[in-house]
Protein backbone atom coordinates (compact mmCIF):
# COMPACT_ATOMS: atom_id res chain seq x y z
CA UNK A 1 0.00 0.00 0.00
CA UNK A 2 0.96 3.62 -0.21
CA UNK A 3 2.94 5.23 2.52
CA UNK A 4 1.18 7.53 4.94
CA UNK A 5 4.25 9.70 5.45
CA UNK A 6 3.24 13.28 5.96
CA UNK A 7 -0.36 12.50 6.79
CA UNK A 8 0.02 13.61 10.38
CA UNK A 9 -2.20 12.11 13.06
CA UNK A 10 -4.84 9.65 12.03
CA UNK A 11 -7.91 8.44 13.78
CA UNK A 12 -8.35 4.76 14.16
CA UNK A 13 -11.83 3.76 15.12
CA UNK A 14 -12.21 1.09 17.76
CA UNK A 15 -12.40 -2.32 16.12
CA UNK A 16 -15.84 -3.56 15.26
CA UNK A 17 -15.97 -7.06 16.66
CA UNK A 18 -18.77 -9.54 16.07
CA UNK A 19 -20.47 -8.56 19.30
CA UNK A 20 -20.63 -4.96 18.18
CA UNK A 21 -21.65 -5.84 14.63
CA UNK A 22 -24.45 -7.95 16.06
CA UNK A 23 -25.96 -4.70 17.33
CA UNK A 24 -26.45 -3.36 13.84
CA UNK A 25 -29.92 -3.53 12.40
CA UNK A 26 -30.25 -5.24 9.02
CA UNK A 27 -29.62 -2.69 6.27
CA UNK A 28 -32.63 -0.73 5.02
CA UNK A 29 -34.45 -2.60 2.29
CA UNK A 30 -35.11 0.34 -0.03
CA UNK A 31 -32.11 2.58 -0.62
CA UNK A 32 -30.72 4.15 -3.76
CA UNK A 33 -27.30 3.66 -2.20
CA UNK A 34 -26.04 2.14 1.02
CA UNK A 35 -23.19 3.72 2.94
CA UNK A 36 -21.69 3.23 6.34
CA UNK A 37 -23.00 5.35 9.18
CA UNK A 38 -21.19 8.60 9.91
CA UNK A 39 -18.23 8.71 12.23
CA UNK A 40 -16.89 5.34 13.24
CA UNK A 41 -20.11 3.63 12.27
CA UNK A 42 -19.94 0.26 10.59
CA UNK A 43 -23.64 -0.37 10.23
CA UNK A 44 -25.21 0.41 6.89
CA UNK A 45 -27.64 3.20 6.28
CA UNK A 46 -29.11 4.99 3.28
CA UNK A 47 -26.90 7.55 1.62
CA UNK A 48 -28.20 11.09 1.33
CA UNK A 49 -29.10 12.08 -2.19
CA UNK A 50 -28.39 15.29 -4.06
CA UNK A 51 -30.04 18.31 -2.48
CA UNK A 52 -30.61 16.68 0.90
CA UNK A 53 -29.42 18.42 4.07
CA UNK A 54 -26.18 17.05 5.48
CA UNK A 55 -23.39 17.76 7.90
CA UNK A 56 -20.42 16.35 9.69
CA UNK A 57 -22.50 14.19 11.99
CA UNK A 58 -25.35 13.28 9.65
CA UNK A 59 -25.60 10.35 7.28
CA UNK A 60 -23.11 10.52 4.43
CA UNK A 61 -23.83 11.95 1.01
CA UNK A 62 -23.92 9.41 -1.79
CA UNK A 63 -20.97 8.74 -4.05
CA UNK A 64 -20.06 11.64 -6.29
CA UNK A 65 -21.64 14.11 -3.87
CA UNK A 66 -20.14 16.45 -1.31
CA UNK A 67 -21.67 18.09 1.70
CA UNK A 68 -21.31 21.81 1.25
CA UNK A 69 -22.74 24.75 3.16
CA UNK A 70 -24.74 27.28 1.23
CA UNK A 71 -22.53 29.93 -0.46
CA UNK A 72 -24.10 32.73 1.55
CA UNK A 73 -23.64 30.93 4.87
CA UNK A 74 -22.08 33.31 7.40
CA UNK A 75 -20.64 30.50 9.51
CA UNK A 76 -19.95 27.64 7.10
CA UNK A 77 -18.14 25.41 9.55
CA UNK A 78 -20.89 25.80 12.10
CA UNK A 79 -23.43 25.04 9.40
CA UNK A 80 -21.73 21.72 8.73
CA UNK A 81 -21.53 20.94 12.43
CA UNK A 82 -25.24 21.72 12.69
CA UNK A 83 -26.18 19.62 9.67
CA UNK A 84 -27.17 22.59 7.55
CA UNK A 85 -25.11 21.69 4.51
CA UNK A 86 -26.47 20.29 1.26
CA UNK A 87 -25.35 17.27 -0.73
CA UNK A 88 -24.16 18.68 -4.04
CA UNK A 89 -22.44 17.25 -7.08
CA UNK A 90 -18.73 16.98 -6.36
CA UNK A 91 -17.75 18.35 -9.76
CA UNK A 92 -19.83 21.46 -9.13
CA UNK A 93 -17.69 22.43 -6.16
CA UNK A 94 -14.31 21.60 -7.68
CA UNK A 95 -13.80 25.18 -8.77
CA UNK A 96 -13.86 26.20 -5.11
CA UNK A 97 -10.79 24.09 -4.49
CA UNK A 98 -8.25 26.21 -6.36
CA UNK A 99 -6.11 26.74 -3.29
CA UNK A 100 -6.28 23.20 -2.02
CA UNK A 101 -3.02 21.86 -0.69
CA UNK A 102 -2.13 18.59 -2.43
CA UNK A 103 -3.84 15.74 -0.61
CA UNK A 104 -1.88 12.48 -0.45
CA UNK A 105 -3.44 9.54 -2.28
CA UNK A 106 -5.27 6.96 -0.23
CA UNK A 107 -3.39 3.79 0.61
CA UNK A 108 -4.13 1.06 -1.89
CA UNK A 109 -6.12 1.64 -5.04
CA UNK A 110 -6.53 5.33 -5.75
CA UNK A 111 -9.73 4.77 -7.65
CA UNK A 112 -13.00 4.51 -5.78
CA UNK A 113 -13.46 0.92 -4.77
CA UNK A 114 -16.39 -1.00 -3.36
CA UNK A 115 -14.89 -0.58 0.06
CA UNK A 116 -14.95 3.18 -0.38
CA UNK A 117 -18.65 3.31 0.08
CA UNK A 118 -18.78 6.61 1.87
CA UNK A 119 -17.33 8.83 -0.78
CA UNK A 120 -19.69 11.61 0.15
CA UNK A 121 -17.48 14.05 2.00
CA UNK A 122 -17.65 17.38 3.72
CA UNK A 123 -16.87 20.67 2.01
CA UNK A 124 -16.84 24.25 3.17
CA UNK A 125 -15.29 27.48 1.99
CA UNK A 126 -12.68 27.05 4.71
CA UNK A 127 -12.14 23.31 4.72
CA UNK A 128 -12.10 20.64 2.10
CA UNK A 129 -11.98 16.94 2.62
CA UNK A 130 -11.04 13.89 0.70
CA UNK A 131 -12.54 10.85 2.30
CA UNK A 132 -10.92 7.49 1.77
CA UNK A 133 -11.53 4.24 3.49
CA UNK A 134 -8.14 2.66 3.99
CA UNK A 135 -7.10 -0.63 5.45
CA UNK A 136 -5.00 -0.28 8.60
CA UNK A 137 -3.16 -3.44 7.64
CA UNK A 138 -1.66 -1.44 4.76
CA UNK A 139 -1.61 1.88 6.51
CA UNK A 140 1.42 2.34 8.78
CA UNK A 141 -0.05 4.41 11.56
CA UNK A 142 2.22 6.93 13.16
CA UNK A 143 2.10 9.95 15.40
CA UNK A 144 -0.97 10.24 17.59
CA UNK A 145 -3.50 7.42 17.24
CA UNK A 146 -6.90 8.24 18.60
CA UNK A 147 -9.26 5.43 19.44
CA UNK A 148 -12.94 6.28 19.17
CA UNK A 149 -14.78 4.45 21.92
CA UNK A 150 -17.99 2.58 21.39
CA UNK A 151 -21.06 4.67 22.06
CA UNK A 152 -24.32 2.97 22.87
CA UNK A 153 -26.82 4.12 20.28
CA UNK A 154 -29.63 1.96 21.51
CA UNK A 155 -32.36 3.81 19.68
CA UNK A 156 -30.97 2.57 16.39
CA UNK A 157 -29.39 -0.62 17.76
CA UNK A 158 -26.01 0.56 16.49
CA UNK A 159 -22.57 1.04 17.91
CA UNK A 160 -20.15 3.67 16.72
CA UNK A 161 -17.48 1.28 15.63
CA UNK A 162 -15.57 0.33 12.54
CA UNK A 163 -14.44 -2.85 10.86
CA UNK A 164 -10.80 -2.84 11.87
CA UNK A 165 -10.22 -5.60 9.40
CA UNK A 166 -11.77 -3.55 6.67
CA UNK A 167 -11.23 0.12 7.10
CA UNK A 168 -10.07 3.15 8.96
CA UNK A 169 -11.52 6.54 8.29
CA UNK A 170 -9.22 9.45 7.72
CA UNK A 171 -10.24 12.92 6.76
CA UNK A 172 -7.87 15.30 5.05
CA UNK A 173 -8.42 19.00 5.46
CA UNK A 174 -6.69 21.80 3.65
CA UNK A 175 -6.94 25.54 3.42
CA UNK A 176 -9.06 26.52 0.48
CA UNK A 177 -9.30 30.22 0.07
CA UNK A 178 -6.60 32.49 1.47
CA UNK A 179 -3.23 31.57 2.88
CA UNK A 180 -3.49 30.98 6.61
CA UNK A 181 -0.72 33.47 7.28
CA UNK A 182 -3.21 36.17 6.36
CA UNK A 183 -5.39 35.24 9.32
CA UNK A 184 -5.17 35.82 13.04
CA UNK A 185 -4.16 33.18 15.58
CA UNK A 186 -7.66 31.78 16.04
CA UNK A 187 -8.10 31.10 12.35
CA UNK A 188 -4.66 29.55 12.24
CA UNK A 189 -5.54 27.26 15.14
CA UNK A 190 -8.74 26.24 13.40
CA UNK A 191 -6.90 25.53 10.15
CA UNK A 192 -4.23 23.66 12.07
CA UNK A 193 -6.81 21.57 13.89
CA UNK A 194 -8.48 20.60 10.66
CA UNK A 195 -5.26 20.07 8.75
CA UNK A 196 -3.56 17.95 11.35
CA UNK A 197 -6.36 15.98 12.91
CA UNK A 198 -7.79 14.96 9.56
CA UNK A 199 -10.77 13.23 11.03
CA UNK A 200 -13.48 15.76 11.73
CA UNK A 201 -16.14 13.48 10.27
CA UNK A 202 -15.22 10.55 12.47
CA UNK A 203 -14.89 12.40 15.72
CA UNK A 204 -17.58 12.62 18.36
CA UNK A 205 -18.79 16.23 18.72
CA UNK A 206 -17.27 16.61 22.16
CA UNK A 207 -13.95 15.20 21.04
CA UNK A 208 -12.50 18.27 19.37
CA UNK A 209 -12.56 21.96 20.10
CA UNK A 210 -12.94 24.17 17.07
CA UNK A 211 -12.18 27.69 18.24
CA UNK A 212 -14.71 30.47 17.93
CA UNK A 213 -13.07 33.05 15.67
CA UNK A 214 -14.03 36.52 14.59
CA UNK A 215 -13.89 37.67 10.97
CA UNK A 216 -10.28 38.79 11.30
CA UNK A 217 -9.24 35.41 12.61
CA UNK A 218 -8.80 36.44 16.25
CA UNK A 219 -10.47 34.68 19.15
CA UNK A 220 -13.94 35.71 20.19
CA UNK A 221 -14.29 36.46 23.89
CA UNK A 222 -16.31 33.36 24.65
CA UNK A 223 -15.06 29.88 23.81
CA UNK A 224 -17.08 26.73 24.45
CA UNK A 225 -16.76 23.02 24.03
CA UNK A 226 -19.66 21.55 22.06
CA UNK A 227 -22.74 20.53 23.98
CA UNK A 228 -23.40 16.83 24.42
CA UNK A 229 -27.08 16.18 24.09
CA UNK A 230 -28.83 18.34 26.65
CA UNK A 231 -25.64 18.87 28.60
CA UNK A 232 -24.21 22.33 27.99
CA UNK A 233 -20.59 22.52 26.91
CA UNK A 234 -17.89 23.91 29.17
CA UNK A 235 -17.24 27.60 28.39
CA UNK A 236 -14.49 30.05 29.23
CA UNK A 237 -13.35 33.56 28.38
CA UNK A 238 -10.23 34.44 26.43
CA UNK A 239 -8.44 37.46 25.06
CA UNK A 240 -8.05 38.07 21.33
CA UNK A 241 -5.00 35.82 21.27
CA UNK A 242 -6.82 32.92 22.91
CA UNK A 243 -5.26 33.24 26.34
CA UNK A 244 -7.74 32.15 29.03
CA UNK A 245 -8.86 34.87 31.39
CA UNK A 246 -9.02 33.70 35.01
CA UNK A 247 -12.31 33.60 36.85
CA UNK A 248 -14.52 33.27 33.82
CA UNK A 249 -15.50 29.63 33.36
CA UNK A 250 -18.60 27.51 33.65
CA UNK A 251 -19.15 23.79 33.82
CA UNK A 252 -22.42 24.12 31.94
CA UNK A 253 -24.85 24.74 34.78
CA UNK A 254 -24.91 28.45 34.11
CA UNK A 255 -23.80 30.68 31.28
CA UNK A 256 -20.44 32.40 31.39
CA UNK A 257 -20.40 36.12 30.68
CA UNK A 258 -17.38 37.75 29.13
CA UNK A 259 -18.82 41.29 29.02
CA UNK A 260 -15.81 43.18 30.27
CA UNK A 261 -13.33 41.25 28.20
CA UNK A 262 -11.92 42.75 25.03
CA UNK A 263 -11.11 40.40 22.21
CA UNK A 264 -11.08 42.90 19.39
Amino acid sequence: GASSAGLGPVVRCEPCDARALAQCAPPPAVCAELVREPGCGCCLTCALSEGQPCGIYTERCGSGLRCQPSPDEARPLQALLDGRGLCVNASAVSRLRAYLLPAPPAPGNASESEEDRSAGSVESPSVSSTHRVSDPKFHPLHSKIIIIKKGHAKDSQRYKVDYESQSTDTQNFSSESKRETEYGPCRREMEDTLNHLKFLNVLSPRGVHIPNCDKKGFYKKKQCRPSKGRKRGFCWCVDKYGQPLPGYTTKGKEDVHCYSMQSK
Epitope: C16, A18, E115
Partner: antibody, heavy 116, light 107 residues
Protein backbone atom coordinates in the same frame (compact mmCIF):
# COMPACT_ATOMS: atom_id res chain seq x y z
CA UNK B 1 -22.40 -16.80 29.37
CA UNK B 2 -24.74 -15.84 26.54
CA UNK B 3 -27.55 -18.34 26.01
CA UNK B 4 -30.63 -18.45 23.83
CA UNK B 5 -33.08 -21.16 24.88
CA UNK B 6 -35.97 -21.95 22.57
CA UNK B 7 -39.33 -23.57 23.22
CA UNK B 8 -40.01 -27.21 22.36
CA UNK B 9 -41.02 -28.91 19.14
CA UNK B 10 -44.47 -28.27 17.69
CA UNK B 11 -46.74 -30.23 15.35
CA UNK B 12 -49.33 -28.13 13.54
CA UNK B 13 -51.98 -28.60 10.91
CA UNK B 14 -51.95 -26.63 7.68
CA UNK B 15 -53.61 -23.23 8.12
CA UNK B 16 -52.79 -23.09 11.83
CA UNK B 17 -50.35 -20.76 13.59
CA UNK B 18 -47.27 -21.44 15.65
CA UNK B 19 -45.50 -19.23 18.17
CA UNK B 20 -41.90 -20.06 19.05
CA UNK B 21 -40.17 -18.45 22.02
CA UNK B 22 -36.51 -17.64 22.57
CA UNK B 23 -35.36 -16.76 26.10
CA UNK B 24 -32.10 -14.84 26.27
CA UNK B 25 -29.69 -14.71 29.19
CA UNK B 26 -26.11 -13.69 29.88
CA UNK B 27 -26.25 -10.27 28.22
CA UNK B 28 -28.28 -7.06 28.17
CA UNK B 29 -31.28 -8.13 26.13
CA UNK B 30 -32.22 -4.67 24.89
CA UNK B 31 -28.76 -3.97 23.49
CA UNK B 32 -29.16 -6.48 20.67
CA UNK B 33 -31.75 -7.45 18.12
CA UNK B 34 -32.93 -10.99 17.57
CA UNK B 35 -33.03 -12.58 14.14
CA UNK B 36 -34.96 -15.66 13.16
CA UNK B 37 -33.55 -18.16 10.68
CA UNK B 38 -35.16 -21.39 9.55
CA UNK B 39 -33.85 -24.55 7.96
CA UNK B 40 -35.93 -27.19 6.24
CA UNK B 41 -34.69 -30.74 6.67
CA UNK B 42 -31.54 -31.28 4.63
CA UNK B 43 -31.77 -27.75 3.24
CA UNK B 44 -29.91 -24.47 3.69
CA UNK B 45 -30.53 -21.54 5.99
CA UNK B 46 -33.20 -18.94 5.32
CA UNK B 47 -33.35 -15.56 7.07
CA UNK B 48 -36.88 -14.73 8.21
CA UNK B 49 -36.45 -11.36 9.81
CA UNK B 50 -35.19 -9.34 12.74
CA UNK B 51 -36.60 -7.47 15.71
CA UNK B 52 -34.97 -4.81 17.82
CA UNK B 53 -35.20 -5.80 21.45
CA UNK B 54 -34.81 -2.15 22.36
CA UNK B 55 -37.69 -0.53 20.49
CA UNK B 56 -39.50 -3.34 18.70
CA UNK B 57 -38.57 -2.25 15.19
CA UNK B 58 -38.82 -5.12 12.76
CA UNK B 59 -37.49 -6.07 9.36
CA UNK B 60 -39.14 -9.09 7.77
CA UNK B 61 -38.21 -11.07 4.69
CA UNK B 62 -40.56 -10.03 1.92
CA UNK B 63 -41.71 -13.59 1.20
CA UNK B 64 -43.01 -13.95 4.76
CA UNK B 65 -44.52 -10.47 5.06
CA UNK B 66 -48.07 -10.69 6.35
CA UNK B 67 -47.61 -14.17 7.79
CA UNK B 68 -44.88 -13.56 10.34
CA UNK B 69 -44.86 -11.44 13.46
CA UNK B 70 -41.87 -10.98 15.73
CA UNK B 71 -42.24 -9.57 19.23
CA UNK B 72 -40.21 -9.26 22.41
CA UNK B 73 -40.97 -9.15 26.10
CA UNK B 74 -38.18 -7.19 27.76
CA UNK B 75 -39.40 -8.05 31.25
CA UNK B 76 -38.55 -11.70 30.63
CA UNK B 77 -35.82 -11.16 27.98
CA UNK B 78 -37.79 -13.30 25.57
CA UNK B 79 -38.30 -12.98 21.84
CA UNK B 80 -41.21 -14.56 19.99
CA UNK B 81 -41.81 -15.50 16.39
CA UNK B 82 -45.33 -16.26 15.26
CA UNK B 83 -45.99 -17.76 11.83
CA UNK B 84 -49.56 -17.93 10.59
CA UNK B 85 -51.36 -19.81 7.82
CA UNK B 86 -48.89 -22.64 8.04
CA UNK B 87 -48.16 -24.74 4.97
CA UNK B 88 -46.35 -28.01 4.63
CA UNK B 89 -43.28 -26.23 3.27
CA UNK B 90 -43.01 -24.32 6.56
CA UNK B 91 -41.85 -27.55 8.17
CA UNK B 92 -38.38 -26.67 9.41
CA UNK B 93 -36.15 -26.11 12.37
CA UNK B 94 -36.57 -22.49 13.50
CA UNK B 95 -33.59 -20.78 15.09
CA UNK B 96 -33.36 -17.52 16.95
CA UNK B 97 -29.99 -15.80 16.81
CA UNK B 98 -28.55 -12.74 18.47
CA UNK B 99 -27.83 -9.92 16.07
CA UNK B 100 -29.03 -8.10 13.01
CA UNK B 101 -26.29 -8.64 10.44
CA UNK B 102 -23.93 -11.00 12.22
CA UNK B 103 -25.36 -13.84 14.27
CA UNK B 104 -22.90 -14.51 17.04
CA UNK B 105 -25.08 -16.71 19.29
CA UNK B 106 -27.84 -19.10 18.29
CA UNK B 107 -30.65 -20.92 20.03
CA UNK B 108 -30.75 -24.72 19.88
CA UNK B 109 -33.57 -24.67 17.36
CA UNK B 110 -37.25 -25.58 17.44
CA UNK B 111 -38.64 -28.17 15.06
CA UNK B 112 -42.01 -27.17 13.66
CA UNK B 113 -43.78 -29.87 11.70
CA UNK B 114 -46.77 -28.95 9.56
CA UNK B 115 -48.76 -32.03 8.66
CA UNK B 116 -52.37 -32.89 8.08
CA UNK C 1 -32.12 -10.27 -3.57
CA UNK C 2 -28.41 -10.97 -3.37
CA UNK C 3 -27.86 -14.58 -4.41
CA UNK C 4 -24.97 -16.34 -2.68
CA UNK C 5 -23.46 -19.26 -4.58
CA UNK C 6 -21.15 -21.61 -2.74
CA UNK C 7 -18.80 -24.09 -4.33
CA UNK C 8 -18.26 -26.91 -4.14
CA UNK C 9 -21.52 -28.14 -2.67
CA UNK C 10 -19.57 -30.98 -1.08
CA UNK C 11 -16.00 -32.14 -0.85
CA UNK C 12 -14.07 -35.06 0.60
CA UNK C 13 -10.84 -34.41 2.41
CA UNK C 14 -8.46 -35.99 4.87
CA UNK C 15 -7.24 -34.79 8.25
CA UNK C 16 -4.36 -32.38 7.69
CA UNK C 17 -5.57 -31.28 4.25
CA UNK C 18 -5.89 -27.65 3.27
CA UNK C 19 -9.49 -26.98 2.35
CA UNK C 20 -10.82 -24.01 0.40
CA UNK C 21 -14.49 -23.12 0.03
CA UNK C 22 -15.62 -20.27 -2.20
CA UNK C 23 -18.66 -18.05 -2.06
CA UNK C 24 -19.76 -15.74 -4.85
CA UNK C 25 -22.31 -12.94 -4.50
CA UNK C 26 -24.57 -11.93 -7.38
CA UNK C 27 -23.61 -8.29 -6.75
CA UNK C 28 -20.90 -6.54 -4.80
CA UNK C 29 -21.34 -6.82 -1.05
CA UNK C 30 -18.08 -5.10 -0.08
CA UNK C 31 -16.77 -7.01 2.96
CA UNK C 32 -20.17 -7.71 4.47
CA UNK C 33 -19.80 -11.47 4.50
CA UNK C 34 -19.85 -14.00 7.34
CA UNK C 35 -19.06 -17.72 7.53
CA UNK C 36 -20.77 -20.29 9.75
CA UNK C 37 -20.10 -23.92 10.58
CA UNK C 38 -22.98 -26.31 11.25
CA UNK C 39 -22.80 -29.86 12.51
CA UNK C 40 -25.73 -32.28 12.19
CA UNK C 41 -28.51 -31.58 14.66
CA UNK C 42 -26.80 -28.44 15.93
CA UNK C 43 -27.22 -24.72 15.41
CA UNK C 44 -24.79 -22.88 13.17
CA UNK C 45 -21.69 -21.36 14.76
CA UNK C 46 -20.08 -18.09 13.65
CA UNK C 47 -16.53 -18.58 12.38
CA UNK C 48 -15.62 -15.48 10.36
CA UNK C 49 -17.28 -12.08 10.17
CA UNK C 50 -16.62 -9.07 7.94
CA UNK C 51 -15.04 -11.40 5.37
CA UNK C 52 -11.78 -11.93 7.23
CA UNK C 53 -12.17 -11.37 10.98
CA UNK C 54 -11.88 -14.49 13.10
CA UNK C 55 -14.59 -14.84 15.71
CA UNK C 56 -13.38 -15.13 19.28
CA UNK C 57 -12.68 -18.73 20.28
CA UNK C 58 -12.42 -20.02 16.71
CA UNK C 59 -9.14 -21.82 15.91
CA UNK C 60 -6.66 -19.87 13.79
CA UNK C 61 -6.61 -22.59 11.14
CA UNK C 62 -9.80 -20.96 9.85
CA UNK C 63 -9.34 -17.85 7.75
CA UNK C 64 -11.44 -15.80 5.40
CA UNK C 65 -10.59 -13.49 2.53
CA UNK C 66 -12.16 -11.59 -0.33
CA UNK C 67 -14.27 -8.54 -0.97
CA UNK C 68 -16.77 -7.39 -3.55
CA UNK C 69 -18.24 -10.55 -5.02
CA UNK C 70 -15.70 -13.32 -4.40
CA UNK C 71 -14.89 -14.76 -1.00
CA UNK C 72 -12.96 -17.70 0.33
CA UNK C 73 -12.99 -19.69 3.56
CA UNK C 74 -9.79 -21.65 4.12
CA UNK C 75 -9.07 -24.37 6.67
CA UNK C 76 -5.29 -24.61 6.70
CA UNK C 77 -5.07 -28.07 8.24
CA UNK C 78 -8.31 -29.97 8.51
CA UNK C 79 -9.03 -31.49 11.92
CA UNK C 80 -11.50 -34.29 12.76
CA UNK C 81 -13.88 -31.82 14.39
CA UNK C 82 -13.99 -29.69 11.22
CA UNK C 83 -16.11 -32.17 9.25
CA UNK C 84 -19.35 -30.20 8.96
CA UNK C 85 -21.35 -28.01 6.60
CA UNK C 86 -20.18 -24.44 6.02
CA UNK C 87 -22.40 -21.53 5.03
CA UNK C 88 -21.59 -18.03 3.85
CA UNK C 89 -24.02 -15.20 4.58
CA UNK C 90 -24.17 -11.66 3.22
CA UNK C 91 -25.17 -8.80 5.48
CA UNK C 92 -25.02 -6.06 2.87
CA UNK C 93 -28.66 -5.94 1.89
CA UNK C 94 -32.06 -7.11 3.02
CA UNK C 95 -33.12 -9.86 2.84
CA UNK C 96 -29.99 -11.31 4.35
CA UNK C 97 -29.13 -14.40 2.35
CA UNK C 98 -27.05 -17.54 2.86
CA UNK C 99 -25.14 -19.68 0.44
CA UNK C 100 -26.40 -23.20 -0.21
CA UNK C 101 -23.73 -24.71 2.00
CA UNK C 102 -20.62 -26.82 1.49
CA UNK C 103 -20.49 -30.19 3.16
CA UNK C 104 -16.96 -31.24 4.15
CA UNK C 105 -16.81 -35.03 4.45
CA UNK C 106 -14.11 -37.47 5.44
CA UNK C 107 -12.32 -39.02 2.49
Amino acid sequence: QVQLVQSGAEVKKPGASVKVSCKASGYTFTSYGISWVRQATGQGLEWMGWISAYNGNTNYAQKLQGRVTMTTDTSTSTAYMELRSLRSDDTAVYYCARGGIVFDYWGQGTLVTVSS
Amino acid sequence: DVVMTQSPSSLSASVGDRVTITCRASQSISSYLNWYQQKPGKAPKLLIYAASSLQSGVPSRFSGSGSGTDFTLTISSLQPEDFATYYCQQSYSTPLTFGGGTKVEIK
